[in-house]
Structures are given as structure tokens and as C-alpha cells.
């Protein structure tokens, strides 16, 4: 027989030889970190077929780390369901508790003994410090100094000193969450007021109001003979601007009565666009100018469409 088989859990006793005679026996022992549990054989014999009789390392068991109990208000979960060396122990805390210490311990071999890589962690109750105070507003339970998991506070805005109220920007309620962190940033209290939305050649059809505060929503339609350029619905956003911007009502182009001449590559043409009669300050551009980014009223349309009046 040639060299005897090798195994993960056991090793040959003595040095292997290049060849073995029929009937010759070799013995194995459990490797370091494994221990023998009878009755399975740990030897094999070279038989008449010049092959080794079947043998396995099933009798050698991995050393195991000491049993770890579940931490209070948590669980110790062995990876692969075993405490054997080379494997991990995962620790998780119940809802409302957080882990102090290592989330994973490793079962390691020190000499011939399997021991855990560190101390088991503990599960501590999630507690939050008081949530942030906000300018121009307050929150419920302002006298409480320590908040437990899922305790919630609700913010509200103070009465405003001027004619316009403070608006609450963000979520009014936040709660004490995992890792002792509040579920989201505190909201903000500030005056949000959008300008009166003027649409020339159109009108507002819904969302009427004295003033337009945060989240006010307005809808428009254009007069007959005009079409809407932009969104028919706009909302007052937290920056006191309309989102999307206030639309425009542009003149519907009349149907073309004459077919324009076809241009060949060799023909040079110069086109002139008549400036609208309404232009009181010199010729207007025949392109559509960029929309002003000012959060106010729209300017009258200064585009080529107007030049067809």
C-alpha cells in the first residue's frame, strides 16, 4: 500500500513510510484540539488489494468551549449550533436593550484547551437623554431627565410674536430608539410664508387663502387660448418658496397657414422675429429666458410665443 490516508481530526502515529506491506497496520491519534470517544477504530490495515481498510476520524471530536448562558435580556446564539473551537458565539439583546461588550466571541484553542476569546457581553436597557430643545418651540415631557426605549415626545411651536405663525418643519413626534439615539432629528419651528402666486393669463382654482404658509397647496388653470407651462399644482415648501415654481400661461400658437419653404444646405437665410408690440423697453429676446430663481411672482413670458400676438 502507498501512504495511508490523512484526516482533518486525526494524525498518524509515527512517521509515514513510502510503502507498506499487506497486513501491515498503522495507528492514528486525535490531533491537538480533538479528543477520542470510543468505540470507533482509529487504525487501518493494508489489505490484499493494496488498499487501506476503511477508517474515518469520526471518533475524534473537536474540543468545545465552556457553555455560555444567555445574557440577561438577551440571547447567546452559537453559530452552526456548536460550541466547538473555530466557531463563533453571537450575542443579541432583546428589543429595548443594547449590547455592551463584544457582539461575537470566538472559540479558540489555547494549548489543547478550547476557550472563548473574551468575556461575554451584557445587555443594558436602552435609555435616552432628553431630546434637543428647539428654538420657538417645545416638547412634551420636558421635565423628564431619562427616557426609556420607545418613549416618545411631541414637539409644538410657540405662538409667533408677529402676524405670521411658526410652522413645524419635520416630524412632530420622535421616540427613544436603538443605541439610545432619538429616532430622528428634532423638527424646526420657523415662519414659512410663500408669496402670493400670480399667474398672468390664468387664475387660481383651489387652495385660496389669506396667506400661504408651510405646505399650502394651490392649483391653477389658464385662460382660454393659453396653456400651462409648468405644474398646475404648487406647494409652499420649508424655504418659503413654491415647489415646483409658479407656472406660466403661454399663448397657444395659431395653426400655421403657410408651409415654410424647405431650406437647402446652400441657401443662406436670416430670420427676423418681430418684437411684440407690448415690449416697452426695446426688443425682447425670441428665446425663452431662464425662470427667475426668486421665490416670488412670475415675470410675464418673454418668449417667441408672445411675438405671434
Amino acid at each position: 500500500c502507498e501512504e495511508p490516508p490523512t484526516f482533518e481530526a486525526m494524525e498518524l502515529i509515527g512517521k509515514p513510510k513510502p510503502y507498506y506491506e499487506i497486513g501491515e497496520r498503522v495507528d492514528y491519534k486525535c490531533k491537538k484540539g480533538y479528543f477520542y470517544i470510543p468505540p470507533l477504530a482509529t487504525h487501518t490495515i493494508c489489505d490484499r488489494n493494496h488498499t487501506w481498510l476503511p477508517v474515518s476520524d469520526d471518533a475524534c471530536y473537536r474540543e468545545t468551549c465552556p457553555y455560555i448562558r444567555d445574557p440577561l435580556n438577551g440571547q447567546a446564539v452559537p453559530a452552526n449550533g456548536t460550541y466547538e473551537f473555530g466557531y463563533q458565539m453571537h450575542f443579541i439583546c432583546n428589543e429595548g436593550y443594547y449590547l455592551i461588550g463584544e457582539e461575537i466571541l470566538y472559540c479558540e484553542l489555547k494549548g489543547s484547551v478550547a476557550i472563548w476569546s473574551g468575556k461575554p457581553p451584557i445587555c443594558e436597557k436602552v435609555l435616552c437623554t432628553p431630546p434637543p430643545k428647539i428654538k420657538n418651540g417645545k416638547h412634551t415631557f420636558s421635565e423628564v431627565e431619562v427616557f426609556e426605549y420607545l418613549d416618545a415626545v411631541t414637539y409644538s411651536c410657540d405662538p409667533a410674536p408677529g402676524p405670521d405663525p411658526f410652522s413645524l418643519i419635520g416630524e412632530s413626534t420622535i421616540y427613544c430608539g436603538d443605541n439610545s439615539v432619538w429616532s430622528r432629528a428634532a423638527p424646526e419651528c420657523k415662519v414659512v410664508k410663500c408669496r402670493f402666486p400670480v399667474v398672468e393669463n390664468g387664475k387660481q382654482i383651489s387652495g385660496f387663502g389669506k396667506k400661504f404658509y408651510y405646505k399650502a397647496t394651490v392649483m391653477f388653470e389658464c385662460d382660454k387660448g393659453f396653456y400651462l407651462d409648468g405644474s398646475d399644482t404648487i406647494v409652499c415648501d420649508s424655504n418659503s418658496t413654491w415647489d415646483p415654481p409658479v407656472p406660466k400661461c403661454l399663448k397657444v400658437l395659431p395653426p400655421s397657414s403657410t408651409k415654410p419653404p424647405a431650406l437647402s444646405h446652400s441657401v443662406s437665410t436670416s430670420s427676423t422675429t418681430k418684437s411684440p408690440a407690448s415690449s416697452a423697453s426695446g426688443p425682447r429676446p425670441t428665446y425663452k429666458p431662464p425662470v427667475s430663481n426668486y421665490p416670488g411672482y412670475p415675470k410675464p413670458e418673454e418668449g417667441i410665443l408672445d411675438s405671434l400676438d
Epitope: C194, R195, F196, F208, G296, Y297
Partner: antibody, heavy 118, light 107 residues
């Protein structure tokens, strides 16, 4: 405090052009819109046009072809120009500041009388 | 354009009277209506905005009401300084337009 003061030529010959300057104080033209409103003798008020904080304008369509409103923010001045005046353009011309972003005419100048006559 | 019609065009009342001026729009204006006072010397003041909101510094004897196309200004207890011409103004649609005015005199 908020003040608006119009200064005009007083007398304009028919078919000539009109220029009026409105000088404001107590607020910035970058923050408030200005409208022009006129009142013919013994008659009612008539809105001519507006210049927004960003310099954009809207005009009463009845005057669109001969009216122009502009401004110089740094000098706190708003300008009204009207072409081809006729006798029925005789009126007191008021420069007016709107309320905070809303078309409520909250502050009025004292007005300047423009007489169109040969 | 939206036409604004004021009635009456003039009226006389005694001091202490309750006076009502009406303003009618040629189409619905959704409360987008203001009232102004013009004194005999030509000075103009905003009295009421958005149909019924009193502008700062305006005495509480002035009030406004209405909806749709019909609106009114009421002076509950006429004072000598209320002698003036009153104008309504719509702002739902450009061009912004005024009523013809109501001239108020003392009997």
C-alpha cells in the same frame, strides 16, 4: 419709517413721453414689490403695473404697448416711463408698496400730478 | 378684465351711523378683495385685506365681509375722520382692478 415719494414733470405735451421717479426709504426694493397706480381727476383708481423684487414686471394690458417700469435697487428708485401721452392720461400717479409679498397696497406715495396739455 | 362695481357711488350719513358700502365683481374672486380709504387731500390707506382682515392701525369700527362676487365694507359708528372715498380692489387675476369708489359725506 416706510416712505415713497414720486417726482414728475408736472406738465407734458400731447404725444410726448412721461418719466416719473419714485424714491423709497425705510425698506429695500430687493424685499418689496412696487406698483404704479393712477387716478384721473375726479375719477377712480387704475392699476398700471408692478415691478417685482427680482426685477420682473407685469403690466395692465391696456397700457402694455406704451408702459415700462424699471428700478435701481442701489439708489432705491423705481422708474415709470409712458410713451405717447394724450390728454386722458392726465392723472395723479401714485407709487405704491405692496404688503409683504401680497397684492395689498399697504403704503402709498403722496402722488404726483401729471397734466397732459398743449 | 374683472369689473368691480361699487354701490352707492356716493352717500350721506350722520355721525354715529352704521354705513355699508357694497362691491360686486363680474366673476367670483374667492375673497381676494381689499378696501382702501382715500381722504380729500388724496392720501390713500389700506383698510381691509382678504375681505375681512383689518390692516394694522385701522380702527375696529371698520369691518368687511362677503364671498363669491358680493362684498361689503361696514363702518359701525361713523366718525368725522371717516369722511373719504372708499375703493374695493380684487387681486385674484391680473390686471388688478378697483371699484369706481363710494364718496362718503356727513349729513
Amino acid at each position: 419709517q416706510v416712505q415713497l415719494k414720486e417726482s414728475g414733470p408736472g406738465l407734458v405735451a400731447p404725444s410726448q413721453n412721461l418719466s416719473i421717479t419714485c424714491t423709497v426709504s425705510g425698506f429695500s426694493l430687493t424685499s418689496y414689490d412696487i406698483s404704479w397706480i393712477r387716478q384721473p381727476p375726479g375719477k377712480g383708481l387704475e392699476w398700471l403695473g408692478v415691478i417685482w423684487t427680482d426685477g420682473g414686471t407685469n403690466y395692465n394690458s391696456a397700457f402694455m404697448s406704451r408702459l415700462s417700469i424699471s428700478k435701481d435697487n442701489s439708489k432705491s428708485q423705481v422708474f415709470l416711463k409712458m410713451n405717447s401721452l394724450q390728454t386722458d392720461d392726465t392723472a395723479i400717479y401714485y407709487c405704491v408698496r405692496v404688503y409683504d409679498g401680497y397684492p395689498w397696497f399697504a403704503y402709498w406715495g403722496q402722488g404726483t400730478l401729471v397734466t397732459v396739455s398743449a | 378684465d374683472i369689473q368691480m362695481t361699487q354701490t352707492p357711488s356716493s352717500l350721506s350719513a350722520s355721525l354715529g351711523d352704521r354705513v355699508t358700502i357694497s362691491c360686486s365683481a363680474s366673476q367670483g374672486i374667492s375673497n381676494y378683495l381689499n378696501w382702501y380709504q382715500q381722504k380729500p387731500d388724496g392720501t390713500v390707506k389700506l383698510l381691509i385685506y382678504y375681505t375681512s382682515s383689518l390692516h394694522s392701525g385701522v380702527p375696529s369700527r371698520f369691518s368687511g365681509s362677503g364671498s363669491g362676487t358680493d362684498y361689503s365694507l361696514t363702518i359701525s359708528n361713523l366718525e368725522p375722520e371717516d369722511i373719504a372715498t372708499y375703493y374695493c380692489q380684487q387681486y385674484i387675476k391680473l390686471p388688478w382692478t378697483f371699484g369706481g369708489g363710494t364718496k362718503l359725506a356727513i349729513k
